[in-house]
């Protein structure tokens, strides 16, 4: 029997302080550059070594960034999203969505801790 891959989605508020070389990450996505099918959201594509994000340790490659300093990133062109980060100031608050891959057992099997509903 094949296993099933599920995702555990969590949200987190991450406060970063801009370092000497900036925030230290790259993004993909936007209404003109869909990275995930049927989703024009903004995703972290690269965390730069020794940058502010890497030193903080919470932001991960693959995270979806929902807002910057309270400003929603929905329905933005890619470059508009980039500009938002560049103009975000010294202290930057990110609302992010982490997707953690969870490998379940074979289909039809329910583990001890799983809800029975």
């Amino acid at each position: 029997m094949n296993g099933r891959v599920d995702y555990l989605v969590t949200e987190e508020e991450i406060n970063l302080t801009r370092g000497p070389s900036g925030l230290g990450f790259n993004i993909v996505g936007g209404t003109d550059q869909q990275y995930v099918s049927n989703d024009s959201g903004i995703y972290v594509s690269r965390i730069k070594e020794n940058g502010a994000a890497a030193l903080d340790g919470r932001l991960q490659e693959g995270d979806k960034i929902l807002s910057v300093n309270g400003q929603d990133l929905k329905n933005l062109l890619h470059q508009d999203a980039v500009d938002l980060f560049r103009n975000a100031g010294y202290a930057v608050s990110l609302r992010v969505q982490h997707r953690l891959q969870v490998q379940n057992g074979p289909i039809g099997h329910r583990g001890e801790g799983d809800p029975s509903g």
Epitope: S21, G22, L23, G24, F25, N26, I27, V28, G30, D32, Q33, Y35, S45, R46, K48, H78, Q79, V82, F85, R86
Partner: nanobody
Framework: HVQLVESGGGLVQPGGSVRVSCVSS????????IGWFRQAPGKEREGVSC???????YYVDSVKGRFTISRDNAKNTVYLQMNSLKPEDTAVYYC????????????????????WGQGTQVTVS
């Protein structure tokens, strides 16, 4: 395994033209910024031109109007067409790739790049 291979350099007369190419393998160009950089003997590597992940082109002032960057995602290739060449354009030309767009600086910043080719020599003489 990400790999970048440059080609197309050579010896050119002043005022002449040459096109250098950068072929990528191990990744799909679509979401990558690609930069062209050059390094003359005894000098630091400097940005020349780049094209970001949504196709926007950037040039340093010294090459504006003479150099043109373009990309062919289907061929996984980025080109730098260099016209009206000058002796000061003599250098080893490198291409580099970066996944996505840096939130800190434009694609002309060499510090942003993770992957580099081995370079191709262009001599204007």
């Amino acid at each position: 395994h990400v790999q970048l291979v440059e080609s197309g350099g050579g010896l050119v007369q002043p005022g002449g033209s040459v096109r250098v190419s950068c072929v990528s393998s191990g990744f799909i160009l679509d979401y990558y910024a690609i930069g062209w950089f050059r390094q003359a003997p005894g000098k630091e590597r400097e940005g020349v031109s780049c094209i970001d992940s949504v196709g926007r082109a950037y040039y340093v002032d010294s090459v504006k109007g003479r150099f043109t960057i373009s990309r062919d995602n289907a061929k996984n290739t980025v080109y730098l067409q260099m016209n009206s060449l000058k002796p000061e354009d003599t250098a080893v030309y490198y291409c580099a790739a970066d996944f996505g767009s840096s939130v800190d600086s434009t694609c002309l910043n060499k510090q942003q790049y993770d992957y580099w080719g081995q370079g191709t020599q262009v001599t204007v003489s």
